[in-house]
């Protein structure tokens, strides 16, 4: 607890202080007093700095004395002999004796007391700023007239700060100015304008005139300018040293202008004014602004247009334009969209085709679409290529978006026909020479494939079963085999309107119009065993001479066997139809002359002994196109004959070929559109 | 007509082989695809194998894997079926049987050959 | 290989009933299955092929069906001369496998 006053004694006092001893008294006064501490005894054996028995006197940090031997007074009227005066409210004494004396001494006898001190004056640091006022205990500081005492009771400063400016234009000056400004101060003054609009701050350097900086380049007295988190200072001197235009890109701007103690200048007039807030023109790759200016402020709004080729893209939905509008921040808004390269992405497969993985999809990439050669072609031109344009489409220059079609390259065997050791009126053959080769299992018969839907037979095979189940790509009819081969599933049977259904088919004599089609569920993929023929074309080309060879195959009845197990074929020659009518019927079921015959029908074979024969039926006469020697046209079916061996009866296809279009595209599925 | 006409009954020791024949009148061996089946007293029936014509190549079932050979003679339209290593659990009739046509699987069967495997 | 599983291994019936043996198979082999039809000390004999076609000269009687993994073999009458062992056979690929087959015998 503090005391104004007190006494310390040595131990032992008035006796002999004894041996090794240290003690330390605390001694405190109030808050506002200074200490002044007097020895009016003082008897303790000396040494050389006191080392062996010492009293010291410690403010702090600071030894302000340390104290051996006898004192007597010089004041004959004072019995002080020794006396410290601190500025300070605490003090430490500390008393130590060594382990021996030579002599006996009595110690010491010191007092203490409260003493005022002058903050005013005692201290280096001046505490006011202005005026400075002791009193006991304490001190309090004073300002001149206009003046004001700031929180901390010690600085003074003129009221200089609050002003907030929120006009357009304006003008704000140092207090007093042109006179000089008031020392000690710190005066802020606020500007804050509509969002949108910066600040933008005009000097002219002669209006400028503040305490130069020290040697150090430190501004004493500084005026700064802060706007956000941007500074612009400080500044001082005499002229106004930083640009006479600041553009604060800001709409709140805080002016600050701190002095000191010293130096007085006139201080300085600024004027502000308000600009619609700029924002930058952007380069904004593979784009158009619309409007074009040179320079954008705030509320302007500009639509960013993507040159072609190139898109916007905000979540999954890609746009070609986009509003900018010029905001209150000295920022574009939707800032993050770009105008990026369109992206066509991954192309669509087609069927029986494929198209190469490419590089690249976006705006510009080229790739080429190829059809599963040699057993597909491209129907429908263009080549192919197809370009990622503008639009986000894969674009082909004759085709536009639509894909390309790969349709089944027609009439082309992947291997020649070549007529080997004879067999009863024919060889054997592969299905190779024959891709088009279809069997018909119940009736056993034949067809051909013209497309991946269609097959074309002979009307008297699927007369009296129209769920035939067929098999394409084996040249073995053995079971074995055709489990191995593709099956081919009927979806529906459409037989010529011009044939004639009987109710007893076996005794037939009219076969005109001998022709069917069977549309299949699912389309045939094409491959070296399985390929479609070619129909014959409307032109006279395609009109039949006597002698023009054709090929027949099948899995009929040959000499030896009712049915062959592996595919035959022959060579045969187109004749008159008089040589089929002169042929005699081998079983007749009803007259000879009740046996019809027609320009629908084709007369070949008499060569040879070779023929198509029971089994047979449906299936192809073959004949080399006159304009492509490379392919092969169904020229007939096979139908019917007086006798196995001789000369046949084949429906002339080119007859039909109008029937066939149109029965196929009337039932034509959108996937083969 | 056709008709397949096997070699008569054998009676085999453990271990030994015996070779099965099967003649083909009324027709042609090259126009046949000859397949082999077994059967043991009192037991189902089991497909030992063929050769199949179009890929000139025999095809074994798993079970005779290495212990079965079928040949074919065209000269004399038989066929063959050897087996060898014989064990007790191969006496059985076997049966020579042609494959048929357009989804029948068995057209011809032989009159079969017992074969007796005992010590 | 394809496994080929029969139900019942033994089936007692009388004349006249209508009687249901199945077949299935391990894995699918589309239609390629085949009945057979063996009595003692004799060669099979086909019935149906390609799971439901009736081979030329087996009486209306039976009938076969299903597709894929299971099949069914049905005699809608059962005659004497019908008591016998019957066969399922598949034969999808050149691996041919039968049965372990069924016996119809008198109740």
């Known amino acids: 607890e503090p005391t104004m006053y007190g006494e310390i004694l040595s131990p032992n006092y008035p006796q002999a202080y004894p041996s090794e001893v240290e003690k330390s008294w605390d001694i405190e006064v109030p808050e506002g007093y200074g200490i002044h501490l007097y020895f009016t005894h003082l008897d303790i054996e000396l040494s050389e700095n006191c080392a062996y028995d010492s009293v010291q006197i410690i403010s702090g940090d600071t030894e302000e004395g340390r104290l051996c031997g006898q004192r007597s007074s010089n004041n004959p009227h004072s019995p002080i002999v020794e006396e410290f005066q601190v500025p300070y409210n605490k003090l430490q004494v500390i008393f130590k004796s060594d382990f021996s004396n030579e002599e006996r001494f009595t110690g010491f006898a010191a007092y203490y007391v409260a003493t005022d001190i002058n903050e005013c004056t005692d201290f280096v640091d001046v505490p006011c700023s202005h005026f400075c006022n002791n009193f006991i205990g304490g001190y309090f500081c004073s300002c001149p007239p206009e003046y004001f005492l700031h929180d901390d009771m010690k600085n003074c400063g003129v009221n200089c700060s609050g002003d907030v400016f929120t006009a357009l234009i304006g003008e704000i000056a140092s207090p007093n100015y042109p006179k000089p400004y008031p020392e000690n101060s710190r005066c802020e003054y606020q500007i804050r304008l509509e969002k949108g609009f910066q600040v933008v701050v005009t000097l002219r350097r002669e209006d400028f005139d503040v305490e130069a900086a020290d040697s150090a380049g430190n501004c004493l007295d500084s005026l700064v300018f802060v706007a956000g988190d941007r500074q612009f200072g400080p500044y001082c001197g005499h002229g106004f040293p930083g640009p006479l235009n600041i553009e604060t890109k800001s709409n709140a701007l805080d002016i600050i202008f701190q002095t000191d103690l010293t130096g007085q200048k006139k201080g300085w007039k600024l004027r502000y004014h308000g600009d619609p807030m700029p924002c930058p023109k952007e380069d904004t790759p593979n784009s158009v602004w619309e409007p074009a200016k040179a320079k954008y402020v705030f509320r302007d709004v500009v639509q960013i247009t993507c040159l072609d080729g190139f898109e916007v893209v905000e979540g999954r939905v890609g746009a070609t334009s986009f509003y900018s509008t010029c905001q209150s921040n000295g920022k574009w808004s939707n800032s993050k969209l770009k105008c990026q390269p369109v992206d066509c992405g991954i192309p669509e497969s087609i069927e029986n085709g494929k198209v190469e993985d490419p590089e690249s999809t976006l705006f510009g990439s080229v790739i080429r679409y190829t059809c599963e050669e040699p057993y597909y072609y491209m129907e429908n031109g263009g080549g192919g290529e197809y370009h990622c344009a503008g639009n986000g489409s894969w674009v082909n220059e004759v085709l536009g978006p639509e894909l390309p079609k790969c349709v089944p390259v027609c009439g082309v065997p992947r291997e020649p026909f070549e007529e080997k050791q004879r067999i009863i009126g024919g060889s054997d053959a592969d299905i190779k020479n024959f891709p088009w080769q279809v069997f018909f299992d119940n009736p056993w018969a034949g067809g051909a494939l013209i497309n991946e839907y269609w097959v074309l037979t002979a009307a008297h095979v699927v007369e009296g079963n129209r769920e035939p189940t067929m098999y394409v790509g084996s040249t073995s009819v053995q079971t074995s085999r055709l489990a191995k081969s593709k099956m081919l599933t009927p979806e529906h049977v459409f037989i010529h309107p011009g044939w004639k259904l009987l109710e007893v088919p076996e005794g037939r004599t009219n076969f005109d119009n001998d022709i069917a089609l069977v549309r299949l569920k699912d389309p045939v993929k094409m491959g070296p065993t399985v390929s479609p023929i070619c129909l014959p074309g409307t032109s006279s080309d395609y009109n039949l001479m006597d002698g023009d060879l054709g090929l027949i195959s099948g899995w009929g009845r040959t000499e030896k066997r009712d049915r062959a197990v592996r595919l035959k074929a022959a060579r045969l020659p187109v004749a008159p139809l008089r040589k089929c009518k002169e042929v005699k019927v081998e079983k007749p079921t009803a007259d000879a002359e009740a046996y019809v015959f027609t320009p629908n029908m084709i007369c070949a074979g008499g060569e040879k002994g070779m023929d198509s024969c029971k089994g047979d039926s449906g299936g192809a006469f073959a004949v080399q196109d006159p304009n492509d020697k490379t392919k092969f046209y169904a020229a007939g079916l096979v139908s019917w004959g007086p006798q196995c061996g001789t000369y046949g009866l084949y429906t002339r296809v080119k007859n039909y070929v109008d029937w066939i279009m149109k029965t196929m595209q009337e039932n034509s599925t959108p996937r083969e559109d | 007509e056709v008709q397949l006409v096997q070699s008569g009954a054998e009676v085999k020791k453990p271990g030994a082989s015996v070779k099965v024949s099967c003649k083909v009148s009324?027709?042609?061996?090259?126009?046949?695809?000859m397949h082999w089946v077994r059967q043991a007293p009192g037991k189902g029936l089991e497909w030992m194998g063929t050769f199949d014509p179009e890929e000139g190549e025999t095809i074994y079932a798993q079970k005779f894997q290495g212990r079965v050979t079928m040949t074919e003679d065209t000269s004399t339209d038989t066929a063959y079926m050897e087996l060898s290593s014989l064990r007790s659990e191969d006496t059985a009739v076997y049966y020579c049987?042609?494959?048929?046509?357009?989804?029948?699987?068995?057209?011809?069967w032989g009159q079969g050959t017992l074969v007796t495997v005992s010590s | 290989d394809i496994q080929m599983t029969q139900s019942p291994s033994t089936l007692s019936a009388s004349v006249g009933d209508r009687v249901t043996i199945t077949c299935r198979a391990s894995q699918s082999i589309s239609s390629w299955l085949a009945w057979y039809q063996q009595k003692p000390g004799k060669a099979p004999k086909l019935l149906i092929y390609?799971?439901?076609s009736l081979e030329s000269g087996v009486p209306s009687r039976f009938s076969g069906s299903g597709s894929g993994t299971e099949f069914t073999l049905t005699i809608s009458s059962l005659q004497p001369d019908d008591f016998a062992t019957y066969y399922c056979q598949s034969y999808n690929s050149y691996v041919w496998t039968f049965g372990q087959g069924t016996k119809v015998e008198i109740k």
């Open positions: 390609k799971a439901s």
């Open positions: 049987v042609t494959e048929g046509l357009a989804g029948v699987p068995f057209d011809l």
């Open positions: 009324g027709d042609t061996l090259t126009e046949l695809s």
